[in-house]
Interface confidence: low
């Protein structure tokens, strides 16, 4: 799915209001420095691509994130604010239902959610531009970070 046409500010608002807190709840009891961030993203569409992959694609050692509260809210936000996203996810969701067994919070899952936190933070923190202007612009030069 191409996330270029999503309403980034609406997704950001959803993250700030609820998803961020759900991620913290999931990670409670884990030190913030316990895992090194190895996954990064360069702009908002790229960040959403990586976020979707880590949230919904089962990985070795962690097949159980899709039904977590933060995952469901992420899915809802993408479905609402990314045109055509829902249709692309129907088959993937069916496959995930089959793959899902019991809810187990493994160390690998904690590491994966730690990576997710980093990706969301990057999504919400537009990079400063090289020109040195006094305006804080996103990578795609369309959104100012202080608009909520």
């Amino acid at each position: 799915y191409d996330f270029t046409n999503c309403d980034f500010e609406k997704i950001k608002a959803a993250y700030l209001s609820t998803i961020s807190k759900d991620l913290i709840t999931y990670m409670s009891g884990t030190k913030s420095t316990e895992f090194n961030n190895t996954v990064s993203c360069s702009n908002r569409p790229h960040c959403l691509t990586e976020i979707q992959s880590l949230t919904f694609n089962p990985t070795a050692g962690c097949a159980s994130l899709a039904k977590e509260m933060f995952a469901m809210k992420t899915k809802a936000a993408l479905a609402i604010w990314c045109p055509g996203y829902s249709e692309t996810q129907i088959n993937a969701t069916q496959a995930m239902k089959k793959a899902r067994k019991s809810k187990v919070t493994t160390n690998k899952c904690l590491e994966q959610v730690s990576q997710l936190q980093g990706l969301w933070r990057r999504f919400n923190r537009p990079l400063l531009k090289q020109q040195g202007s006094s305006d804080y612009k996103d990578d795609d030069d369309k959104h100012h970070h202080h608009h909520h």
Partner: antibody, heavy 121, light 105 residues
């Protein structure tokens, strides 16, 4: 534990330049912005500029534009602030301050210990 | 540039009293941060995003406000609360207020 350790005090002559370093540890250096803030004796805090270690992008307080240069060395997790054409009124304590994204805003959550720069002939 | 004006510049109060510090912005801002600074020390984050207390800050502190008017309140002053408090905004670049010194009367 997040730590920002700054270089030692400097004494400079008017017209010279000074370069202050800020070594970061305890977090992923490229994940957060780094601000530079100064405080002249008995005065308010004055924001000088900000840099994104991720891509080297900068933004400066117009007051210092042309005189201040912010840079980073990602491999050393160190930020630098260079101020040129020094004058006596640049005598101040210079702080680096990490800026983290809290739920609802960018805040300077960790500060260096400060570097005293004295400009005197 | 958004200018932040803090008042009063100095607040002389006794322990146990209530302190109200004001910060006014020249234009509307999204949120306000507050920092505490003691002599010879770097500033410490005190209140994030208008009303969220930083880690370790006692519950007697509170923050409120919106638009151009923000307030830091200390319900009952303790000896360790006497310091200078700065407000800071980030909606347009970053600027600090002139500070309010809370001193013992």
């Amino acid at each position: 534990e997040v730590q920002l350790v700054q270089s030692g005090a400097e004494v400079k002559k008017p017209g010279a330049s000074v370069k202050v370093s800020c070594k970061a540890s305890g977090y992923t250096f490229t994940d957060d912005y780094m601000n530079w803030v100064r405080q002249a004796p008995g005065q308010r805090l004055e924001w000088m500029g900000i840099i994104s270690p991720y891509n080297g992008g900068t933004s400066y307080n117009q007051k210092f534009k042309g005189r201040v240069t912010l840079t980073v060395d990602k491999s050393a997790s160190t930020a630098y602030m260079e101020l040129s054409s020094l004058r006596s009124e640049d005598t101040a304590v210079y702080y680096c301050a990490r800026e983290d994204y809290d739920y609802d805003g960018y805040a300077m959550d960790y500060w260096g210990q400060g570097t005293t720069v004295t400009v005197s002939s | 540039e958004i200018v932040l004006t803090q008042s009063p510049a100095t607040l002389s109060l006794s322990p146990g009293e209530r302190a109200t510090l004001s910060c006014r912005a020249s234009s509307s801002v999204s949120y306000m941060h507050w920092y505490q600074q003691k002599p010879g020390q770097a500033p410490r984050p005190w209140i994030y995003a208008t009303s969220n207390l930083a880690s370790g800050v006692p519950a007697r502190f509170s923050g409120s406000g919106s638009g151009t008017s923000y307030t830091l309140t200390i319900s009952r002053l303790e000896p360790e609360d006497f310091a200078v408090y700065y407000c800071q905004q980030w909606s347009s670049d970053r600027t600090f207020g002139g500070g309010t010194k809370v001193e013992i009367k």
